[in-house]
Amino acid sequence: NWVNVISDLKKIEDLIQSMHIDATLYTESDVHPSCKVTAMKCFLLELQVISHESGDTDIHDTVENLIILANNILSSNGNITESGCKECEELEEKNIKEFLQSFVHIVQMFINTS
């Protein structure tokens, strides 16, 4: 469930603190409820960037697990089509810490509406 997703995000946050990853990531910091799935897709795609840049097994595994969890949760809700949402590349670029904080916020949005 989404609680496990948050715990994976916290784990990623802890793991990257011990590394120097200065990437900036497309971050949706003000998610509109009607675009939350699109925003989630962008967060997950950017997580893969963190995984790739870190070259770390623990981060890789945790990112992969998080994507598997999110996929399964969202697929159980059926196909959700959203329109008029920002493309990932249109989002503001932020550092990893801010990116992960915003990611936690969107997950909490899913928790609150489930």
Epitope: S51, T57, H60, N65, S75
Partner: antibody, heavy 122, light 112 residues
Framework: EVRLMASGGGLVQPGGSLRLSCAAS????????MSWVRQAPGKGLEWVAT????????YYPDSVKGRFTISRDNSKNTLYLQMNSLRAEDTAVYYC???????????????WGQGTLVTVSS | DVVMTQSPLSLPVTLGQPASISCRSS???????????LEWYQQRPGQSPRLLIY???NRFSGVPDRFSGSGSGTDFTLKISRVEAEDVGVYYC?????????FGQGTKLEIK
């Protein structure tokens, strides 16, 4: 050439336990997730379990969840499948397979071992 | 769970002729990141399965170019442009987009 050698199969009574092993060589074992897939006699393939590269994350179908445990020892380049509370329907050839992970270009089981036969019968 | 349904289950083909196997999923297997983890495996008689195609249309290394994969959403196809004797066996589609990962029932290709 990537090599995967499954072993540990045999005859076991219903309710019994068995541990399968899969010895990996000719590749960096810790860089790959791994899976077990089984095939009942004359039947199709069924995914049984997957484990992440570091071993922290495991995935199972409901048919084996709570009875089977996938694990790995990266220092020994070995994958395991602990099977408890075995049933007649668990009778199958069990294959281990290397799993290419998504972040390196897509999920797929790119190399398979030769399989080991597990027979559950009284 | 995603159910994968293959057709036909048996496919007699003349050597040198094309062959086509269909695989349909019970729901879209496009994941949240836009990827479709649909694979095709070949199992020759008495052998372990072998990866042919991954992510719908990507041929695995060493797989002859007479094998091709296509499709999207819920409908997928494996095509063999000209069947050779070594192609005899059972072909399985497999989705790895959602847990539990699931195989199709298999299609047995035989020479007429």
């Amino acid at each position: 050439e990537v090599r995967l050698m499954a072993s540990g199969g045999g005859l076991v009574q219903p309710g019994g336990s068995l541990r399968l092993s899969c010895a990996a060589s000719e590749f960096t074992f810790s860089n790959y997730a791994m899976s077990w897939v089984r095939q009942a006699p004359g039947k199709g393939l069924e995914w049984v379990a997957t484990i992440s590269r570091g071993g922290d994350y495991t995935y199972y179908p409901d048919s084996v969840k709570g009875r089977f445990t996938i694990s790995r020892d990266n220092s020994k380049n070995t994958l395991y499948l602990q099977m408890n509370s075995l049933r007649a329907e668990d009778t199958a050839v069990y294959y281990c397979a290397r799993r290419v992970s998504m972040i390196t270009g897509g999920w797929a089981m790119d190399y398979w071992g030769q399989g080991t036969l597990v027979t559950v019968s009284s | 769970d995603v159910v994968m349904t293959q057709s036909p289950l048996s496919l007699p083909v003349t050597l040198g002729q094309p062959a086509s196997i269909s695989c349909r999923s019970s729901q879209s297997i496009v994941d949240i990141t836009g990827n479709t983890y649909l694979e095709w495996y070949q199992q020759r008689p008495g052998q372990s399965p072998r990866l042919l195609i991954y992510k719908v249309f990507n041929r695995f290394s060493g797989v002859p170019d007479r094998f091709s994969g296509s499709g999207s959403g819920t409908d997928f196809t494996l095509k063999i442009s000209r069947v050779e004797a070594e192609d005899v066996g059972v072909y399985y589609c497999f989705q790895e987009s959602f847990v539990p990962y699931t195989f199709g029932q298999g299609t047995k290709l035989e020479i007429k």
